[in-house]
């Protein structure tokens, strides 16, 4: 058992049939000695008497808010939450496995550049009686500071009969060094409490591995005289790290016909312009990736050929 | 370069970009294969890293590129020795078409561009003997290549920026 915050405790339980559970001793926070009784949640049923109450916590029915009273007056409260461990693995019932980039991915994080700022998000089908807290650091044995902002509900989606909620948080490394080679990973820890269930989730990554640039901006097409070819140009996204001579991008360009089945030729270039054949009803697209490190490609930026 | 002369920025840029390509073809990203484990904070101390105070940022390069170039060269020699060690030459054997050989040669080539014959900067101690088990050796190869990818990415940025802004 450990204290999450004042008067709120997490009981760690091995969860299997006929498990013995954990013995917990609650102490009433009062100088009084006599006439003390204990109740659980809104029930008026007296569970025991005396300054301490010993309970065997085995299941969710044993968790909740315990109150000690004297003469009808509440003296103190203790809220017990449960953290389940099944077959040596902590439960992950609250958040949804996003399965990307691999199974058991509950937290996903991305960065638009090397500034030390990143966003993490997670999914759940639970709407009410659900709270989170987030902590982050660089390294774990001698952690360096990372400051995270508010967790906000960033999207709601209907998936069949279920509603899915996406929560996200933005964090910033306190002393980021964009040009250095990261040695220690960023650690992100999210704890989730649903009703009386406590769970925690962690993600560990280097910023370089979660980089995903914004799409290139200002796509422009200039037809070349007496030719089927057009000159296309684009610019680095505003959110990308500067100077661009140091933080360089590479680009993938393609012309996509109206039919999705039509063969697409992809060309890779480090330049911000190219000459392509752009037929009517087709569209030109470009995406960006760090030139020297194979992190994610940006989403496509597109413009119609006509 | 030693003694304060400028490197052949454009040549270094080309070779470092080639190194990036080779490092990724030697160990492509296998579904974000997570090779970090408990205690990795200690094991990562073994390899040289380009750190914040090494002057490899744009401002540091403008002020005095020598500190950064020396750090890069130390790292190149370190990795070149690693790729030539029995971690890579021992069992399990590399495939005949493995890019590790090319990678090894390119590391050597770039380190020599940074230090012509006759000049000697002190280099970092090369790591202790490799593990005996083939599976351990395989895992170590992956970790070294992942670490090398990060190192050469920073080096390539340095040379690209140098070629664009510091070339005579």
């Amino acid at each position: 058992i450990w204290e999450l915050k004042k008067d709120v405790y997490v009981v760690e339980l091995d969860w299997y049939p006929d498990a013995p559970g954990e013995m917990v001793v609650l102490t009433c926070d009062t100088p009084e000695e006599d006439g003390i009784t204990w109740t659980l949640d809104q029930s008026g049923e007296v569970l025991g008497s005396g300054k301490t109450l010993t309970i065997q916590v085995k299941e969710f029915g044993d968790a909740g808010q315990y109150t000690c009273h004297k003469g009808g007056e509440a003296l103190s409260h203790s809220l017990l939450l449960l953290h389940k461990k099944e077959d040596g693995i902590w439960s992950t019932d609250v958040l949804k496995d996003q399965k990307e980039p691999k199974n058991k991915t509950f937290l996903r994080c991305e960065a638009k550049n090397y500034s030390g700022r990143f966003t993490c998000w997670w999914l759940t089908t639970i709407s009410t009686d659900l709270t989170f807290s987030v902590k982050s650091s660089r390294g774990s044995s001698n952690p360096q500071g990372v400051t995270c902002g508010a967790v906000t509900l960033s999207a709601e989606r209907v998936r069949g009969d279920n509603k899915e909620y996406e929560y996200s948080v933005e964090c910033q490394e306190d002393s980021a060094c964009p040009a250095a080679e990261e040695r220690l990973p960023i650690e992100v820890m999210v704890d989730a409490i649903h009703k009386l269930k406590y769970e925690n989730y962690t993600s560990s990554f280097f910023i370089r591995d979660i980089i995903k640039p914004d799409p290139p901006k200002n796509l422009q097409l200039k037809p070349l005289k007496n030719s089927r070819q057009v000159e296309v140009s684009w610019e680095y996204p505003d959110t990308w790290s500067t100077p661009h001579s140091y933080f360089s991008l590479t680009f993938c360009i393609q012309v996509q016909g109206k039919s999705k089945r039509e063969k697409k030729d992809r060309i890779f270039t480090d330049k911000t312009s190219a000459t392509v054949i752009c037929r009517k009803n087709a569209s030109f697209s470009v995406q960006a990736q760090d030139r020297y490190y194979s992190s994610s490609w940006s989403e496509w930026a597109s413009v119609p050929c006509s | 370069v030693p003694g304060g002369s400028s490197p052949a920025w454009a040549q270094c840029q080309q070779l470092s970009q080639k190194l990036c390509t080779l490092a990724w073809s030697a160990h492509p990203l296998v579904g974000h294969m997570d090779l970090r484990e408990e205690g990795d904070e200690e094991t990562t101390n073994d390899v040289p890293h380009i750190q914040c105070g090494d002057g490899c940022d744009p401002q540091g390069l403008r002020d005095n590129s020598q500190f950064c170039l020396q750090r890069i060269r130390q790292g190149l020699i370190f990795y070149e020795k690693l790729l030539g060690s029995d971690i890579f030459t021992g069992e399990p054997s590399l495939l005949p078409d493995s890019p590790v050989g090319q990678l090894h040669a390119s590391l050597l080539g770039l380190s020599q561009l940074l230090q012509p014959e006759g000049h000697h900067w002190e280099t970092q101690q090369i790591p202790s003997p490799s593990p005996s088990q083939p599976w351990q050796r395989l895992l170590l190869r992956f970790k070294i290549l992942r670490s090398l990818q990060a190192f050469v990415a920073v080096a390539a940025r340095v040379f690209a920026h140098g070629a664009a802004t510091l070339s005579p």
Epitope: S127, T128, T131, S133, G149, A150, T152, L153, Y165 | -
Partner: nanobody
Framework: EVQLVESGGGLVQAGGSLRLSCAAS????????MGWFRQASGKKREFVAS????????SYADSVKGRFTISRDNAKNTVYLQMNSLKPEDTAVYYC?????FGSGSYYDLMYDYWGQGTQVTVSS
């Protein structure tokens, strides 16, 4: 210093309506859920309603569902409780609460970190 100040309580006849307000000062509760609890004389403090930061996720005690509506105005840093079809058993001191955690809120008062001083609501029959 964080302060939550409730207002809008008073005496009302059964079937009537009241609107409680809770103004927060000292910090913005961006991302933080807020809630209303009540305590009748000689009884335990009980959950009434909670609302997330966006205002899109609300939760109510069964006893007030369909009669009470919780809402919030983040620009004013204020949360409201519109109480319709009031009954004598709604008589209690109503407390506003805010959590330092994020999400949609909790039924448990110990999960809230900041409290107002309370406003009395009396429903006469």
């Amino acid at each position: 210093e964080v302060q939550l100040v409730e207002s809008g309580g008073g005496l009302v006849q059964a079937g009537g309506s009241l609107r409680l307000s809770c103004a927060a000062s000292g910090r913005t509760f961006e991302g933080n859920p807020m809630g209303w609890f009540r305590q009748a004389s000689g009884k335990k403090r009980e959950f009434v309603a909670s609302i997330d930061w966006s205002g899109g996720i609300t939760s109510y005690a069964d006893s007030v569902k369909g009669r009470f509506t919780i809402s919030r105005d983040n620009a004013k840093n204020t949360v409201y409780l519109q109480m319709n079809s009031l009954k004598p058993e709604d008589t209690a001191v109503y407390y506003c609460a805010a959590s330092a955690r994020f999400g949609s809120g909790s039924y448990y008062d110990l999960m809230y970190d900041y409290w107002g001083q309370g406003t009395q609501v009396t429903v006469s029959s």
